[in-house]
Amino acid sequence: TRDVREPPALKYGIVLDAGSSHTSMFIYKWPADKENDTGIVGQHSSCDVPGGGISSYADNPSGASQSLVGCLEQALQDVPKERHAGTPLYLGATAGMRLLNLTNPEASTSVLMAVTHTLTQYPFDFRGARILSGQEEGVFGWVTANYLLENFIKYGWVGRWFRPRKGTLGAMDLGGASTQITFETTSPAEDRASEVQLHLYGQHYRVYTHSFLCYGRDQVLQRLLASALQTHGFHPCWPRGFSTQVLLGDVYQSPCTMAQRPQNFNSSARVSLSGSSDPHLCRDLVSGLFSFSSCPFSRCSFNGVFQPPVAGNFVAFSAFFYTVDFLRTSMGLPVATLQQLEAAAVNVCNQTWAQLQARVPGQRARLADYCAGAMFVQQLLSRGYGFDERAFGGVIFQKKAADTAVGWALGYMLNLTNLIPADPPGLRKGTDFS
């Protein structure tokens, strides 16, 4: 007999991604004997928390924690019982909670405390509930994308780890309340707040990142609604034949629409707003979200924010993917070039409500908002971030890679798994019949 290596045990980690519109739970797993102090982490399972994001529970913090129970109970079953105590559990909240923290810090604290109280009741190794900064959200999304697409380290056919020669991918995330752009850059950032130095697998990376609060899809829609009320009295991005009653208090309650709030407005007043299917006016309305008037640096993206020229390939995920997927799959429109993306947005914006409903069977939820969403994505990429046709050719729209959701959660987990000691592989006496 001789010593035979047992297959390494699996370790698990849980991340609750508390976004502005909803919360998702991701359970990750990796072999306990990790390579280079970073685990070979993949998604084990996931769970969508029903209802809105935790920031929507400002008036009912205990409701936020109660809403998580179903997914936490699922985690008890998805993670083997003997691994519960050693499984780290994190909750990271993003832009929805950043906004709540700006407007009502007490409510934000109460929600996090309520959630913390519930999470500590579970047998996992709870390691905190916190609000991620925009910079963290961007960087961890970048780490996730490059980790999953094996741009940091790869297992070769000869059974050895090597570093691929290809460069890293940039990452673009469009959430409900903010959007992030992150990519590797060679030159130092003119704005130190936009630069992050990372050391991964013994390699050094200089990364540019910026998060634009209030430029997430849901907040953009609210801002466009406020602009439409202010300037038109109709909504050029909504389809003709679609109309709805809008309560002014709802439109102006977000800090993102504060600048458009009329001095004296009746918050309980209701306004009937109709769509006009006007792509050109819609484009103008969306353009108003971006300011290019001043830049204190050698170059900017928009709103005076420093950004080096976009370089290399990019992966665009979350609402970037869903918007493009809608255009491609539901509308059957080509979106391989910037010109095609613009034409697709114009196509959607030209449709009447009846045409749109007929074109998209099963009446997709909030169908009326897809025009504005498509127009915003097109403008953000081309005018905002400065993608030209050549650079846009290097953008892939993806929601998953290697059966794992692309988003900040895995990157967050990867960063934190470095704190988890690796078990040595189990050695036992056995007969080797080879």
Partner: antibody
Framework: EVQLVQSGAEVKKPGESLKISCKAS????????MDWVRQMPGKGLEWMGD????????TYNQQFKGQVTISADKSIRTAYLQWSSLKASDTAMYYC??????????????????WGQGTLVTVSS | DIQLTQSPSSLSASVGDRVTITCSAS?????IHWFQQKPGKAPKLLIY???NLASGVPSRFSGSGSGTFFTLTISSLQPEDFATYFC?????????FGQGTKVEIK
Amino acid sequence: EVQLVQSGAEVKKPGESLKISCKASGYTFTDYNMDWVRQMPGKGLEWMGDINPKYDISTYNQQFKGQVTISADKSIRTAYLQWSSLKASDTAMYYCARRGFFLYYGINYYYFDVWGQGTLVTVSS
Amino acid sequence: DIQLTQSPSSLSASVGDRVTITCSASSSVSYIHWFQQKPGKAPKLLIYSTSNLASGVPSRFSGSGSGTFFTLTISSLQPEDFATYFCHQWSSYPWTFGQGTKVEIK
């Protein structure tokens, strides 16, 4: 055709136990949560809780936690609502409802798409 | 908990009338669903996610709104529409219903 068939009306005395059922057909039972909704005489609707039959996980409205137990038997595609000790205030119509969903921007949004015919529970001494 | 307040609590109308029922939420919600309930029957889904007509529901029913204010409109009331209507939210735990609006024959 998707159908939810509930057990018949029950008349019970305070302190007695009861288990009512909801049998599903026409769809994959484990793909959807099953919820229970109470309607007291002449009143509105109240969500009580649900069961995820795939994982056998029950969640409850805090108002009903400890008062009722929700369970399911996958093998016979049936969800249950039970009381260990009934009170007169439990007199109501109880509905099971399938939790349907639609996907919007990668998020599942839920609604009750199919309902059982209801089980009337009368608790009286 | 999010309170849903329906207005009016009851109304009398004639066949052919246009009827509007409102549902006001105590906090902003993403969506509202509407149900119709006839005496002795289970509720039936009419509209999901604010404005989407459920399968088999006539086009005279429509829904709209956002945030904290939502409406259900019946463009031309038919004899079979006399019933009680409930709004329902699934944005904030626990999921709640409005108190109902009874539509009666004038």
